[in-house]
């Protein structure tokens, strides 16, 4: 663009040089010019002489109108044809843009992820703005009224350690830019109830040499949270459809989960953890792939109709992937329920 | 760490006009985001205008066309031009540096009151 330009006269914009994107615009060019009494004055978009729309106001000054301007950024100049004069003479330059005021943030989190000393805070920013955009986080003790402000661009890491003379805070979102101003909706938040667990990560798995082979999975954390709970998805590398099943969790011993599984076949496990009765989950583990033990007898085992775990497992589902693009997002199938209690409603969640 | 230090502020008759100054100082100035706000008794501090990059400003909608920030980088110093003031513009008024990721830092602020 145009950023320091000698200008032998003036360029203006309206209704300014940031408007909003489908505004008619008008640009004027005014001449300066000693020595010059120009024949034509001609405008330019990005390079590119503009034949249309053109009106020549006076001797001085001419006029550029656009309908519906679209484009979230141009570089305008405009010139003089002088007589006498072979090249055409630059009179004056600007950059312009055009947007949309921001969308009000949605979905605001805050997550505190342990050990890492931050709240760390989300949002959805809508729509792209097409210019630039700041986002300022609110943070409104409700114990003391103490309010802090910080400056984002699209999330906020908030050390602990500026929290400290409260536990419930509100938090919300303002998104500015030129064109306007949005608020997100508040956000209650309590920092014992944001907490996530340490990483769970399965170490290791193995299948045993039974008559009814069984695979053990090891998986273990660091979190210092004494009441947690599971999930760990499972499938064949071949299959869409996960199996989830639900643990209790006490990670001051590597946990260890059996499953009864086809032979001779490569499975992908994830586990996630949240606090107890909490909301935030952690994010699904890496994969683990594991190859199961080919086949010794000559029974077909189900994983669905196995007599299964003898670790208190809760719940078994299944979840099917929406499409194998996004093996990530799931969508709630059918669940077969093993402990008497259906399989809690945050499936929808998964990835 | 920036400090900042408000001037200008006062009182005028309804339809006056006020310059308000900010004035920095710390190393941290040239990676701020310059920002003006105000807080009447009893509300919420609110953003009035804030410079959100080269050429670009926001204002909020009860200010717009009245008041003009403007900023002057050699002196390491903002101004909010306020004209034709209304009685609901009373407020302390503060300017605010706020760095990416980093808590905002106000300075102490600056009382105007409009009569009418």
């Known amino acids: 663009g145009i950023t320091s330009i000698n200008c032998s006269g003036d360029m203006w914009v309206e209704p300014g040089e940031i408007f909003q994107m489908g505004m008619n615009v008008s640009i004027y060019c005014q001449e300066a010019l000693k020595h010059c009494r120009p024949r034509n004055l001609y405008f330019y978009k990005n390079g590119f002489k503009e034949e249309f729309d053109i009106t020549r106001i006076n001797r001085t000054t001419a006029r550029i109108w656009y309908k519906g301007f679209s484009e979230p950024h141009a570089y305008m100049h405009c010139t003089a044809e002088c007589p006498g004069h072979f090249q055409e003479t630059l009179i004056c330059g600007k950059d312009i843009s055009s947007g949309h005021p921001p969308d009000a943030p949605s979905n605001l989190t805050c997550v505190i992820y342990e050990y890492s000393g931050n709240m760390t805070c989300t949002w959805n920013t809508g729509k792209p703005t097409y210019i630039d955009t700041k986002y300022i986080v609110h943070v409104k003790s409700l114990e003391t009224e103490e309010e802090q402000q910080y400056l984002a661009s699209s999330y906020v890491k908030i050390s602990t350690d500026s929290l400290q003379g409260s536990r419930k805070y509100l938090v919300w979102v303002q998104a500015v830019n030129s064109l306007g101003m949005e608020n997100s909706q508040q956000l209650h938040v309590h920092l014992d109830d944001i907490v996530i667990p340490s990483a769970s990560i399965i170490s290791r798995a193995e299948t045993t040499n039974d008559t009814v082979p069984k695979t053990i999975v090891y998986w273990k954390s660091k979190t210092m949270i004494e009441k947690v709970f599971c999930e760990m998805r499972y499938k064949t590398t071949t299959n869409q459809t996960w199996s989830v099943k639900e643990f209790d969790a006490n990670f001051t011993y590597v946990q260890q989960s059996e499953f009864y599984l086809e032979p001779d076949s490569k499975y992908v496990f994830q586990v996630r953890c949240q606090e107890t009765g909490k909301r935030n989950w952690q994010p699904w583990s890496s994969p683990f792939v594991h190859q199961t033990s080919q086949e010794t007898g000559k029974r077909n085992w189900q994983p669905w109709s196995s007599p299964f775990v003898h670790q208190t497992s809760q719940t078994v589902s299944q979840v099917t992937a929406k499409s194998s693009h996004e093996p990530q997002k799931m969508e709630m199938l059918s669940a077969t329920i093993f402990r008497g209690h259906p399989a809690s409603g945050n499936h929808q969640d998964i990835g | 760490q920036v400090q900042l230090q408000e001037s200008g502020g006062g009182s005028v008759q309804a339809g006056g006009s006020l310059r308000l100054s900010c004035a920095a100082s710390?190393?941290?100035?040239?990676?701020?985001?310059m920002g003006w706000y105000r807080q009447a008794p009893g509300k919420e501090r609110e953003l009035v205008s804030m410079l959100i990059s080269d050429g670009s400003t926001f204002y909020a909608d009860s200010v717009k066309g009245r008041f003009t920030f403007s900023q002057e980088n050699a002196k390491n110093t903002v101004y909010l031009q306020m004209n034709s003031l209304k009685p609901e513009d009373t407020a302390m008024y503060y300017c605010g540096c706020a760095t990416l990721g980093s808590r905002t830092v106000w300075g102490q602020g600056t009382q105007v009151t409009v009569s009418s």
């Open positions: 710390g190393y941290t100035y040239s990676s701020c985001t």
